[in-house]
């Protein structure tokens, strides 16, 4: 892969350890926490990034109405189990043997249970709604300029194929970005919408995962776009299974 050959770093993931010990002395990078080799020509999976984060020192109306089945990540950070490809394992458990099922972006989609809980398949999150509220500006952004800038960002910075950015909605001060990627649409080598959304989320929070790049400087026609609130909704190909107790 294309880890930077000169000083052997990973452009797309600063939470790595790199050394020129690959075949032919090529630079090879491994994710912190898991030790798994990562492909530095593309985004690292969210599962490996979360694992690396948990291993790091602690101090380091035109708008869419989310579906009734949409999930929000209310559980916060945890140390996930990742499969050999770096994806989330369908079942996650903590140190006290409490287990739950997650979707492909690692968000809990069932009630918590014990070690007998079965999670037979990793259910894909096929629709992500990123809901942003921007800080006050002199006037509203031009919708088509905003649309073009956000599409460019996902294409160029996160390497997400343009067809997966389904829509950009704007009703000042709320911006919504819809990412859609069905199982049958995702081709080998495509960036996963869950990974792109996670990189975007970290960028917005000023915690860029890219190596040595400045933070995200989002501008629409020269006007800074500063985000003061972010909410992300996840919609799975198969609806989540929560008890009625949680829903009331």
């Amino acid at each position: 892969h294309t880890a930077a050959q000169d000083n052997c770093t990973c452009p797309t993931n600063k939470m790595t350890v790199c050394s020129p010990d690959g075949p032919g002395g090529r630079c090879q990078c491994r994710a912190l926490g898991s030790g798994m080799a990562v492909d530095c020509s593309t985004l690292t999976s969210k599962c490996l990034l979360l694992k690396a984060r948990m291993s790091a020192p602690k101090n380091a109306r035109t708008l869419v109405r989310p579906s009734e089945h949409a999930l929000v990540d209310n559980d916060g950070l945890y140390d996930p189990d990742c499969d050999p490809e770096g994806r989330f394992k369908a079942r996650q458990c903590n140190q006290t043997s409490v287990c739950w099922c997650v979707n492909s972006v690692g968000v809990r989609r069932t009630d918590k249970g014990d070690l007998s809980l079965r999670c037979d398949e990793l259910v894909r999150t096929h629709h992500i709604l990123i809901d942003l509220r921007h800080r006050p500006t002199a006037g509203a952004f031009n919708h088509s300029d905003l649309d073009a800038e956000l599409r460019r960002l996902f294409r160029e910075r996160y390497r997400l194929h343009p067809k997966f950015v389904a829509a950009v909605h704007y009703e000042q001060p709320t911006i919504q970005i819809e990412l859609r990627q069905n199982t049958s649409q995702k081709a080998a080598g495509d960036v996963d919408i869950g990974d792109a959304a996670y990189y975007f989320e970290r960028d917005i929070k000023g915690e860029s995962l890219f190596q040595g790049r400045g933070g995200l400087d989002l501008r629409v026609r020269g006007e800074p776009l500063q985000v003061e609130r972010t909410l992300i909704y996840y919609l799975d190909e198969i609806p989540p299974k929560f008890s009625m107790k949680r829903l009331t």
Epitope: P84, A90, D120, E121, S184, A188
Partner: antibody, heavy 118, light 109 residues
Framework: QSLEESGGGLVQPGASLTLTCTVS????????MTWVRQAPGEGLEYIGF??????IYYANWAKGRFTISKTSSTTVTLQMTSLTVADTATYFC??????????????WGPGTLVTVSS | YDMTQTPASVSAAVGGTVTINCQAS??????LAWYQQKPGQPPKPLIY???TLASGVPSRFKGSGTGTDYTLTISDLECADAATYYC????????????FGGGTEVVVK
């Protein structure tokens, strides 16, 4: 819609060989392509595939000696080096890849036989 | 990701039923396909995503399973069903030993 493999034949141990898969009747640019082989009387053995963005993935055992590439708008090749008698097999190309689309191979070529012998 | 297929061979009478099992070394989340192969021919897809019939395949062929364990059931056996059957995982892509199971020969008496 069809696939056809070519380039097989008799080669000596240690030699190199390139097989070609020619596609017709469908859009090559929107499909992953896979190589599979089958030794005489044995089962199917996955070699690797090339995705539509050009990403290439190999079976663990095939990394290093086998190279898959797209050489034109209608052909994908499999380069094999340092051939041994154990590489004697019928080589198939198939449409589809792993962890892509429905993740199976829905169209196969008839195969081309490679015999490695001194 | 490696696949273990059992049995290696099975025989049954015309009109009978056979069951073939496939076990993955890790969960493959229903990314499993089944193929039929006859001598001198390439494999023919029967089932994908564990239970979806490929085009033109009769409903006598049924796939099931989740997680690591999958089954192909062929009912109302016909002489034309005599062949070797293979499972194939489609979930792992860069850490794969062999995507295919070892095969099961079905003999129809």
């Amino acid at each position: 819609q069809s696939l056809e493999e070519s380039g097989g034949g008799l080669v000596q141990p240690g030699a190199s060989l390139t097989l070609t898969c020619t596609v017709s009747g469908f859009d090559f640019s929107s499909n992953a392509m896979t190589w599979v082989r089958q030794a005489p009387g044995e089962g199917l053995e996955y070699i690797g595939f090339i995705g539509i963005r050009g990403n290439i993935y190999y079976a663990n055992w095939a990394k290093g000696r086998f190279t898959i590439s797209k050489t034109s708008s209608t052909t994908v090749t499999l380069q094999m080096t340092s051939l041994t008698v154990a590489d004697t097999a019928t080589y198939f190309c198939a449409r589809g890849g792993l962890w892509t689309g429905n993740s199976y191979f829905d169209l196969w070529g008839p195969g081309t036989l490679v015999t490695v012998s001194s | 990701y490696d696949m273990t297929q059992t049995p290696a061979s099975v025989s049954a009478a015309v009109g009978g039923t056979v069951t073939i099992n496939c076990q993955a070394s890790e969960s493959i989340s229903r990314y499993l396909a089944w193929y039929q192969q006859k001598p001198g021919q390439p494999p023919k897809p029967l089932i994908y995503r564990a239970s979806t019939l490929a085009s033109g395949v009769p409903s006598r062929f049924k796939g099931s399973g989740t997680g690591t364990d999958y089954t192909l059931t062929i009912s109302d056996l016909e002489c034309a069903d005599a062949a070797t059957y293979y499972c194939q995982q489609g979930y792992g892509y860069s850490t794969v030993g062999n995507a295919f199971g070892g095969g099961t020969e079905v003999v129809v008496k």
